[in-house]
Amino acid sequence: IWELKKDVYVVELDWYPDAPGEMVVLTCDTPEEDGITWTLDQSSEVLGSGKTLTIQVKEFGDAGQYTCHKGGEVLSHSLLLLHKKEDGIWSTDILKDQKEPKNKTFLRCEAKNYSGRFTCWWLTTISTDLTFSVKSSRGSSDPQGVTCGAATLSAERVRGDNKEYEYSVECQEDSACPAAEESLPIEVMVDAVHKLKYENYTSSFFIRDIIKPDPPKNLQLKPLKNSRQVEVSWEYPDTWSTPHSYFSLTFCVQVQGKSKREKKDRVFTDKTSATVICRKNASISVRAQDRYYSSSWSEWASVPCS
Amino acid sequence: RAVPGGSSPAWTQCQQLSQKLCTLAWSAHPLVGHMDLREEGDEETTNDVPHIQCGDGCDPQGLRDNSQFCLQRIHQGLIFYEKLLGSDIFTGEPSLLPDSPVGQLHASLLGLSQLLQPEGHHWETQQIPSLSPSQPWQRLLLRFKILRSLQAFVAVAARVFAHGAATLSP
């Protein structure tokens, strides 16, 4: 058992049929010695008397807010939450597995540049009685500071019969060094509590591995005289690290016909312009990726050929 | 050339070769479904590799002030990885495929280190740790880890040379 916050405790339970559970001793926070009774949640049923109450915590019915009283007056409370371990694995019932980039991905994080700022998000189908706290650091044995803002509800989607809620948080490394080669990963830890269930989720990554630039900006077409060719030009996204001579991007230019089945023409270039053939009803798209490290491509920026 | 006396390297040549190194490092170990090698335990194996750190002067300002510190750091790393790629971690079982880019990668690391430090000049080099995994599967895992680490190292080196070629070339 350990304290999550003042008077809120997490009981770690091996979860299997007929498991013995955990013996927990609660102590009433009072100088009083006698005439003390204990109740659970809103029930008035007396569970025991005396300054301490010993309970065997086996299931969610044993968790909740324990209150000690004397003569109708509340003396103190303790809230017990459960953290389930099944077959040696902590439960992950609260958040949804996003399965990207691999199974058991509950927290996904992305960075638009090397500034040390990143965003993480997670999904749940639970709407009410749900709380989160978020912590982050660089490294775990001698952690360096990362400051996270508020975890906010960033999207709601309907998925079949279920509503899905997306929460996101922005974090910033306190002393970021954009040009350095990271040797210690960023750690992100999310504590989630749903009703009386406690779970924790972690993600560990290097900023370089979660880089996803914004799409190129100011994508423009300039027809070339007496030709079906056009010059496509674009610029680095505003959010990308500077100077661009150091933090360089590479680009993929794609010509796509109206039908998805039509063959796509693709060119790769380090420049911010390219010459392509513009087919009728086609569109031209450009996306960006770090030139020297194969992290994610940006989303496409597109313009119609016409 | 980045001789210890402090003259400039052939920035454009270094840029081209370091960009080639990036390509080779990724073709030697493409990112297979974000295989997270940090989960595989065994941290100490790649903790000893030289990293380009914050105080090494490899940022744009540091390069403008005095590129020698950074170039020396890069040189140390190139020699270190060149030795690792020539060690029994890569030459032992399981054998690399004949068309594996690791051979080219090894040669290019040597090429870039020689561009930075011609014969007869000597910068300190870092001691290579004695990593002799006994099992083929340990060797395979170590190869992956080394290549992942090398990808990060050469990315920073390539940025340095690209920026140098664009802003510091005579």
Epitope: Q65, H77, T128, L130, T131, T152, Y165, V169 | -
Partner: nanobody, 125 residues
């Protein structure tokens, strides 16, 4: 120093309506769940209603569902409890609570970090 100040409590006839307000100062709670709890004489403090940081998710105790509505105005750092069809059993001191956590909030009062002094609501029959 964080302060939550409740207002709007008074004596009202059964079937009547009241609107409670809770103004927060000392920090903003625009991303944090806030809620109302109540305590009747000789009883434990019980959950009434909670609202998420952006106001999009609300949760009510079964005893007040359909009669009470919780809302918030983040620009004013204030939450409200509109109480309709009041019953004598709604008589209690109503407390405003704010959490330092995120999400949609908890029905357990120990999960809240900041509390107001309370405002008395008395419903006469």
């Amino acid at each position: 120093e964080v302060q939550l100040v409740e207002s709007g409590g008074r004596l009202v006839q059964a079937g009547g309506s009241l609107r409670l307000s809770c103004a927060a100062s000392g920090r903003t709670f625009d991303s944090n769940p806030m809620g109302w709890f109540r305590q009747a004489p000789g009883k434990k403090r019980e959950f009434v209603a909670i609202i998420s940081g952006n106001g999009g998710i609300t949760n009510y105790a079964n005893s007040v569902k359909g009669r009470f509505t919780i809302s918030r105005d983040n620009a004013k750092n204030t939450i409200y409890l509109q109480m309709n069809s009041l019953k004598p059993e709604d008589t209690a001191v109503y407390y405003c609570a704010a959490s330092g956590l995120y999400g949609s909030g908890s029905v357990y009062d120990l999960m809240y970090d900041y509390w107001g002094q309370g405002t008395q609501v008395t419903v006469s029959s």
